[in-house]
């Protein structure tokens, strides 16, 4: 299962850990997505490595764990973000954060 | 014997198209995924692209990205790169290889297939 | 992307002579790196992943060190085989970037 902080909020110009804890006895995570929207944000795949989008390079670091910090924060950044865990054997698990960027 | 056979190369103008194949032979080529690399005449090693074991998702560097598409046929155990608009700094010679599982690092190469583009 | 920086760019050595390559990242890459060997005219060769594990099949002369930024290959006793360019490879980000090569020449 998947397990998240479903809303979360941060400071315009500061930075926030975007984290989904995937908890099982018996699959393995082969991969995992992080989307705003529909708009892909980063991979991790254990037989890649980490690869951020181009247009997110600058203000998004991968970790802690697989997560993801997403820096200098604009209120465009307001919104949903999704993590996708691909599982062996377990399948693929989705959670889902809203984060909320405030005015500074 | 696992092996790996590129072909397609050749002499090329400037905003032209070209298809590289790779042939595998020697392992379960639908379980890896795949890569390209490239070395310019004298220089360094240059990672192009990879592709999934089923072809789900397909990543590349910067230089070649909205140029070059990776692809791959497992029924054919062969794997692909499409050129197009095509520039003289993708002069190269393009290897095709496969990873250690879980590794990330490259134990198979393919012999090479070079590409020259010019007017 | 991540920058790796190989120093020497070429090394003189002899037979029998201990040679270290060095390879920096310009950022951690944990143990994500790899080291290869190339011949004029041949592909690459995967040595080392992992910073340290030996590839199945190649001579125990061959040892790799480090993690986070900087890392080391050595050669104990160098062989006329070893006569190549060697080149580290860095696998914690996509793309994979190379390093600019070392090259061991025969003293």
């Known amino acids: 299962t998947i397990d998240t902080k479903r809303n979360i909020s941060a400071e315009e110009g500061g930075s926030v850990i975007l984290q989904c804890h995937f908890s099982s006895d018996t699959a393995e995570v082969t991969q995992v997505d992080w989307k705003q929207q529909d708009q892909l944000l980063a991979i991790y795949s254990v037989d890649l490595g980490w690869h951020v989008a181009s247009v997110f390079s600058d203000r998004v670091v991968p970790g802690p764990s697989l997560g993801l910090t997403f820096q200098s924060l604009t209120m465009n950044d307001t919104g949903e973000y999704f993590c996708t865990y691909h599982t062996y054997p377990g399948g693929i698990y989705k959670g889902r954060i809203f984060l909320k960027v405030q005015e500074s | 014997e696992v092996q790996l056979v590129e072909s397609g190369g050749g002499v090329v103008q400037p905003g032209r198209s070209l298809r590289l194949s790779c042939a595998a032979s020697?392992?379960?080529?639908?379980?890896?995924?795949m890569h390209w690399v490239r070395q310019a005449p004298g220089k360094g090693l240059e990672w192009v692209a990879v592709?999934?074991?089923?072809?789900?998702?397909?990543l590349y560097a910067d230089s070649v990205k909205g140029r070059f598409t990776i692809s791959r046929d497992n029924s054919k155990n062969t794997l692909y790169l499409q050129m197009n608009s095509l520039r003289a700094e993708d002069t190269a010679l393009y290897y095709c290889?496969?990873?250690?599982?879980?590794?990330?690092?490259?134990?198979?190469w393919g012999q090479g297939t070079m590409v020259t583009v010019s007017s | 992307d991540i920058q790796l920086t190989q120093s020497p760019s070429s090394v003189s050595a002899s037979v029998g002579d201990r040679v270290t390559i060095t390879c920096r990242a310009s950022?951690?890459?944990?143990?994500?790196l790899a080291w290869y060997q190339q011949k004029p005219g041949k592909a690459p060769k995967l040595l080392i992943y992992?910073?340290?594990s030996l590839q199945s099949g190649v001579p125990s002369r061959f040892s790799g060190s480090g993690s986070g930024t900087d890392f080391t290959l050595t050669i104990s006793s160098l062989q006329p085989e070893d006569f190549a360019t060697y080149y580290c490879?860095?696998?914690?980000?996509?793309?994979?970037?190379f390093g600019g090569g070392t090259k061991v020449e025969i003293k």
């Open positions: 290889a496969k990873p250690v599982p879980k590794s990330r690092a490259l134990d198979v």
């Open positions: 020697g392992f379960t080529f639908g379980s890896y995924y």
């Open positions: 592709i999934w074991p089923d072809g789900s998702n397909k």
């Open positions: 950022q951690g890459i944990s143990s994500w």
């Open positions: 992992g910073a340290s």
């Open positions: 490879q860095q696998a914690f980000y996509l793309p994979w970037t």
